[in-house]
């Protein structure tokens, strides 16, 4: 009964830093309490971008100071992160965990690649 | 450098309380599920107890529901056990141990020892 | 609950030898939810893998992990002294955690 969670190989992000990917997962219960994790992999070592829980049915929510953005749906999760550069572009996973009720069930995708490209800076005019 | 460090572990009798601590440093505690697990002498791994980042979900083994309590404080980055109705059969090593971002169990403490006897 | 269980018991091998220990699941753990821990006596124990087959920070290349579904294995390519210890294995894709019982290494 593991879960299985899914989410795009690669992802290119804007010209302004902004990269969106869904992750969906299957659940193999019924929670009422979800926890969303984006974790950035970098060689080996592994850090949190972003976390939020949300209660089903209703809106994910982010920290106000969060990098991250994200809706939800059924067993789909619409998330955006921004502010990236250049040095940001790398393996980003998510993690899902059902909280409540048990059993809990963790959940980890294969990882998005994000490509992040900074823009070339405006020529000045005379 | 990131370290667990429990305390509280000792002699009690049958029926009685005892209350372990973990002092966790060098990493950012609520970000992180914390688990106590324990080894009975010359035995295996048996997992106990978690609790998860913000304190509100908790989970216990059969063996320990209802008598053990998990807590954190992630103000002063500590995790507790409180242990009541202590059995003979509770007598172990108690590790508190960091659940990793991707899962496993990453980081262990040196283990505090409880013996419950008459 | 799933159910770990290690073999053999006790692998009696010398240094320089392979050691290939195994931990079956009563039913599918996804590869991407099992450990293997290392425990010496007196220590607490030092995760090694995860993810089935990952090595952890610090964790020398004779040591390597596969299997998927209900089969894993840890294998030591060559047997250092400091080797000898108790090898578990651990799922933590679902509750309650667990862990087999345990295969210990020793020196022939």
């Known amino acids: 009964k593991a879960m299985h969670v899914a989410q795009p190989a690669v992802v290119l992000a804007s010209s302004r830093g902004i990269a969106s990917f869904v992750c969906e997962y299957a659940s193999p219960g019924k929670a009422t309490e979800v926890r969303v994790t984006v974790l950035r992999q970098a060689d080996s070592q592994v850090t949190e971008v972003c976390a939020a829980t949300y209660m089903m049915g209703n809106e994910l929510t982010f920290l106000d100071d969060s990098i991250c953005t994200g809706t939800s749906s059924g067993n789909q999760v619409n998330l955006t992160i921004q502010g990236l550069r250049a040095m940001d572009t790398g393996l980003y996973i998510c993690k899902v965990e059902l909280m409540y009720p048990p059993p809990y069930y963790l959940g980890i995708g294969n990882g998005t690649q994000i490509y992040v490209i900074d823009p070339e800076p405006c020529p000045d005019s005379d | 450098q990131v370290q667990l460090v429990e305390s509280g572990g000792g002699v009690v009798q049958p029926g009685r309380s005892l209350r372990l601590s973990c002092a966790a440093s060098?990493?950012?505690?609520?970000?992180?599920?914390m688990h106590w697990v324990r080894q009975a002498p010359g035995k295996g791994l048996e997992w106990v107890a978690v609790?998860?980042?913000?304190?509100?979900?908790?989970y216990y083994a059969d063996s320990v529901k209802g008598r053990f309590t998990i807590s954190r404080d992630n103000s002063k980055n500590t995790l507790s056990l409180q242990m009541n109705s202590l059995r003979a059969e509770d007598t172990a090593l108690y590790y508190c141990?960091?659940?990793?971002?991707?899962?496993?169990?990453?980081?262990w403490g040196q283990g505090t020892m409880v013996t419950v006897s008459s | 609950e799933i159910v770990l269980t290690q073999s053999p018991g006790t692998l009696s091998l010398s240094p320089g030898e392979r050691a290939t220990l195994s931990c079956r699941a009563s039913q599918s753990v996804s590869s991407s939810y099992l450990a293997w821990y290392q425990q010496k006596p007196g220590q607490a124990p030092r995760l090694l893998i995860y993810g089935a087959s990952s090595r952890a920070t610090g964790i020398p290349d004779r040591f390597s992990g596969s299997g998927s579904g209900t089969d894993f294995t840890l294998t030591i390519s060559r047997l250092e002294p400091e080797d000898f210890a108790v090898y578990y294995c651990q799922q933590y894709g679902s509750s309650p955690w667990t862990f087999g019982q345990g295969t210990k290494v020793e020196i022939k």
């Open positions: 609790i998860w980042y913000d304190g509100n979900n908790k």
């Open positions: 141990a960091r659940g990793a971002l991707l899962g496993a169990f990453d980081i």
């Open positions: 060098g990493f950012t505690f609520s970000s992180f599920g």
